[in-house]
């Protein structure tokens, strides 16, 4: 059974992941640039199901494309430093999903824009955090 300290650690990691995703979405929503239109043309794979920590495998597999899209957005008004940001998210995701079990991610048929993708994973984090508090 998970201990109180392990639950607290999981909750803090999920809160950090949530904040990182919210920071990206906020940066994109603030973005007044022709590049935004182009960013929205990139398609992301969405998980068929995302209800457990193991499903973060689906997020991990989309981190490289996410970094590429964020690199496109780099400018003096975009302060997210994609390499550092994605590296941070990657570390959190690896810790949260664990490496013991190999989970094959199943994706939905429909792809999504970066905004839909971020909102999906933000909702995922919020829903898991809610079960922990």
């Amino acid at each position: 059974a998970p201990t109180s300290s392990s639950t607290k650690k999981t909750q803090l990691q999920l809160e950090h992941l949530l904040l990182d995703l919210q920071m990206i979405l906020n940066g994109i929503n603030n973005y007044k640039n022709p590049k935004l239109t182009r960013m929205l043309t990139f398609k992301f794979y969405m998980p068929k199901k995302a209800t457990e920590l193991k499903h973060l495998q689906c997020l991990e597999e989309e981190l490289k494309p996410l970094e590429e899209v964020l690199n496109l957005a780099q400018s003096k008004n975009f302060h997210l430093r994609p390499r550092d940001l994605i590296s941070n998210i990657n570390v959190i995701v690896l810790e949260l999903k664990g490496s013991e079990t190999t989970f094959m991610c199943e994706y939905a048929d429909e792809t999504a824009t970066i905004v839909e993708f971020l909102n999906r994973w933000i909702t995922f984090c919020q829903s898991i955090i809610s079960t922990l508090t």
Epitope: H16, R81, N88, Q126
Partner: antibody
Framework: QVQLVQSGAEVKKPGASVKVSCKAS????????VHWVRQAPGQGLEWMGI????????SYAQKFQGRVTMTRDTSTSTVYMELSSLRSEDTAVYYC??????WGQGTLVTVSS | DIQMTQSPSSLSASVGDRVTITCRAS??????LAWYQQKPGKAPKLLIY???NLETGVPSRFSGSGSGTDFTLTISSLQPEDFATYYC?????????FGPGTKVDIK
């Protein structure tokens, strides 16, 4: 539990910049993301943005985009908020807050010619 | 951006009174709501997080309820040290936004 200590009051002229510091002690510096919130005299609370102290990346409220820069120095466990092109409406108390549950004491910035 | 409104904007009450402050979000924020208390010249102090969870060290006379768009902060028996301004704040999405505040003063 982390404690946050902010730099002292500042008086600035319109058009100038101000840099407010927020030093953390008592807990791991990178444990909590740091928000900056300001409060004009007699007014409510206004969120300015957030910085991840470990990664050093930040995200800002649209209102301050292009005028605010949040940075950090991990060697001194300090985060900074710099606001440029100051105008009289920027006169306020500026707070840093770790995870929005531990707050610094506030720094009064007065913008006056 | 999510707009937060509070009512009343101010109220006068006596020690021992039960006080209720309401907060409304312009769109659903689940339970991603916090309540703060602020006294003049001081930083805000977190009272309630996740709509109903009491922050460590906060007296049990404070309680929070609600979800979606409507939230309530209740002080079951007002104490002299509770005269202050109270703010709600949503953390469902960025930018983080605060309510305009409710000032509780002595009747």
């Amino acid at each position: 539990q982390v404690q946050l200590v902010q730099s002292g009051a500042e008086v600035k002229k319109p058009g100038a910049s101000v840099k407010v510091s927020c030093k953390a002690s008592g807990d791991t510096f990178t444990r909590h993301y740091v928000h900056w919130v300001r409060q004009a005299p007699g007014q409510g609370l206004e969120w300015m943005g957030i910085i991840n102290p470990s990664g050093g990346y930040a995200s800002y409220a649209q209102k301050f985009q292009g005028r605010v820069t949040m940075t950090r120095d991990t060697s001194t466990s300090t985060v900074y908020m710099e606001l440029s092109s100051l105008r009289s409406e920027d006169t306020a108390v500026y707070y840093c807050a770790a995870g929005l549950f531990i707050w610094g004491q506030g720094t009064l910035v007065t913008v006056s010619s | 951006d999510i707009q937060m409104t509070q009512s009343p904007s101010s109220l006068s009450a006596s020690v021992g009174d039960r006080v209720t402050i309401t907060c409304r979000a312009s769109q659903s924020i689940g339970r991603w709501l916090a309540w703060y208390q602020q006294k003049p010249g001081k930083a805000p102090k977190l009272l309630i997080y996740s709509a109903s969870n009491l922050e460590t060290g906060v007296p049990s006379r404070f309680s929070g309820s609600g979800s979606g768009t409507d939230f309530t902060l209740t002080i079951s028996s007002l104490q002299p040290e509770d005269f202050a301004t109270y703010y709600c704040q949503q953390a469902n999405s960025f930018p983080v936004t605060f309510g305009p505040g409710t000032k509780v003063d002595i009747k």
